[in-house]
């Protein structure tokens, strides 16, 4: 009588998570008598994954037809495959008895698991910064097998090359995670700017994940300002404009001082947006110059986005009001401004 | 259908000879482990005998020597040779297929009747 | 040869009763232990096999436990049909052996 033998005859099989998985197994000899079992692994801590004789195995069925004993097939087939069912599964066949005694192991099939990449998410920087300036943006994704993956980043379609890529855990796992970091330099144009993370993997058939950020989440534009006057009125009334442009986000609030006190405060509010996806607003005071003996102080004050203050003053001479004065001849800029926020008064 | 037919069952003197058959259709007699099981009137059953799929063959103790188990694959049947039969193995005898894989035993003949007497 | 000890060798009951037998083994069996119904007259019939799992086509009302040397064979309600004699069987060494019987009888 031939030796029995237990053949595995695939070394290594890999199914799509969802999908069913048959694991082929073949004895040689019906003899001697005794049940087939299935596990994961070897040694003590093996996992059973099917008895033939007992227990309760409701995502694995027999192949073959289990009361038909002259076929010595006793592959099995598992259903609803996920990412925790991979690992080396061993067809072992024992010999009836008490116990059963273990009397030949195939030599196991590898199941590895293809599991599609989770859709990647990209997270931009906690705080706004400004052009010129570089912000980090996360990419991650989850839960995909095998461990081979690409990651690309890009710049309104443009390919970025300063960015890093982890893939997690290092060493085998049903499942695996990546997270990349990618380095931007910010520009006052990038606005309407998006950056994309862009994921393929074997599973995806050749059409990658892309998760997207906005830069307008991660920008600041800063105003600049600037002042006009308009001609002296017939009753003795100057209208000073103060000129907030090109800022981003919209949230902006501006106050009017005359000689350091308060005039009036008003908040940015549905505005036009500009081609770039910046702001203007333009507000105006009318000043009294009959009411005032001396020179007017004027400042705009303007407060971005939490930011600190920026100030830009101007000052309405009222000696000598010609009735049809030309803009600008009887105000002098005394502004002192930081951050590009340019002098002069027109 | 799966079915067992025993015959060839009958009177038999002591020290005689006796050969019971039984045909199995619906299934190949030889993919699987075969028995012999009896019942004398008003007893309990029995194992006398069985015959392995490579032709291993087992016995009760009591038969040792006096029975042979065999088989004919060609006609799917199954025979127990009885000889110097005693008055203790008058019974009715069960031809039984044992199970797939454990030899459990599954389906039963409808028995045929050995009486050994003088 | 491995014993086999049915208890209680006859019973008495009633239609819609639920019913024990028990059977002990004399040395370890592990789970190869069967259970057989046979009525007066006719073949034995396979219930139960590897101490719980029951043959195809035989109701739910019969279930099996145990392991090692003690088993238990119970009907859930006991209808008209089911009053017979029951036998467990040893199979895991031969020779096979089978308990004495338990007779269930109408009260």
């Known amino acids: 009588e031939e030796e029995l033998q237990v053949i595995q005859p695939e070394k290594s099989v890999s199914v799509a998570a969802g999908e069913s998985a048959t694991l082929n197994c073949t004895a040689t000899s019906l003899i001697p008598v005794g049940p087939i079992q299935w596990f994961r692994g070897v040694g003590p801590g093996r996992e059973l994954i099917y008895h033939q004789k007992e227990g309760h195995f409701p995502r694995v069925t027999p192949v073959s037809d289990p009361t038909k004993r002259n076929n010595m097939d006793f592959s099995i087939r598992i259903s609803n495959i996920t990412p925790a069912d991979a690992g080396t599964y061993y067809c072992v066949k024992f010999r009836k008895g008490s116990p059963d005694v273990e009397l030949k192991s195939g030599a196991g099939t590898e199941l590895s698991v293809r599991a599609k990449p989770s859709a990647p998410v990209v997270s931009g920087p906690a705080v706004r910064a400004t052009a010129e300036h570089t912000v980090s943006f996360t990419c991650e994704s989850h839960g995909f097998s095998p461990r081979d993956i690409t990651l690309k980043w890009f710049k309104n379609g443009n390919e970025l090359s300063d960015f890093q890529t982890n893939v997690d855990p290092a060493g085998k796992s049903v499942s695996y995670s990546i997270r990349s970091t990618a380095r931007v330099v910010l520009t006052r144009r990038d606005v309407h700017s998006q950056v994309i993370c862009e994921v393929a993997h074997v599973t995806l058939q050749g059409d990658p994940l892309r998760g997207t950020a906005n830069l307008s989440e991660a920008i600041r534009v800063p105003p600049f300002l600037e002042f006009t006057q308009q001609s002296m009125r017939a009753d003795n009334q100057v209208n000073v404009t103060c000129q907030v442009m090109k800022f981003y986000p919209q949230r902006l609030q501006l106050t009017w001082l005359e000689n350091g006190n308060v005039s009036r405060t008003e908040m940015a509010s549905a505005l036009p947006e500009n081609k770039d996806g910046t702001y203007n607003w333009t507000s105006w005071l009318l000043v009294n110059v009959s009411a005032h003996r001396d020179d007017v102080k004027l400042t705009c004050q303007v407060e971005h986005d939490g930011q600190p203050a920026v100030n830009k003053s101007f000052s309405v001479k009222v000696s000598a009001h010609p009735k049809e004065q030309g803009s600008n001849t009887a105000a002098e800029n005394t502004g002192t401004n930081e951050r590009n926020i340019y002098g002069g008064s027109g | 259908e799966v079915q067992l037919v025993e015959s060839g069952g009958g009177l038999v003197q002591p020290g005689g000879s006796l050969r019971l058959s039984c045909a199995a259709s619906g299934f190949t007699l030889s993919s699987y482990d075969m028995h012999w099981v009896r019942q004398a009137t008003g007893k309990g059953l029995e194992w006398v005998s069985a015959?392995?799929?490579?032709?291993?063959?087992y016995y009760t103790g009591s038969v040792k020597g006096r029975f042979t188990i065999s088989r004919e694959n060609a006609k799917n049947s199954l025979y127990l040779q009885m000889n110097s039969l005693r008055a203790a193995d008058t019974a009715v005898y069960y031809c039984?297929?044992?199970?797939?894989?454990?030899?459990?035993?599954?389906?039963w003949g409808q028995g045929t009747m050995v009486t050994v007497s003088s | 040869d491995i014993q086999m000890t049915q208890s209680p060798s006859s019973l008495s009951a009633s239609v819609g009763d639920r019913v024990t037998i028990t059977c002990r083994a004399s040395?370890?069996?592990?789970?190869?232990l069967a259970w057989f119904q046979q009525k007066p007259g006719k073949a034995p019939k396979s219930l139960i096999y590897t101490a719980s799992s029951l043959h195809s086509g035989v109701p739910s009302k019969f279930s099996g436990s145990g392991s090692g040397t003690d088993f238990t064979l119970t009907i859930s309600s006991l209808q008209p049909e089911d009053f017979a004699t029951y036998y467990c069987?040893?199979?895991?060494?031969?020779?096979?052996?089978f308990g004495q019987g338990t007779k269930l009888e109408i009260k």
């Open positions: 015959i392995g799929t490579a032709g291993d063959t």
């Open positions: 040395q370890d069996i592990n789970n190869y």
């Open positions: 039984v297929r044992g199970g797939v894989w454990d030899d459990a035993f599954d389906i």
């Open positions: 069987q040893q199979y895991v060494s031969y020779p096979y052996t």
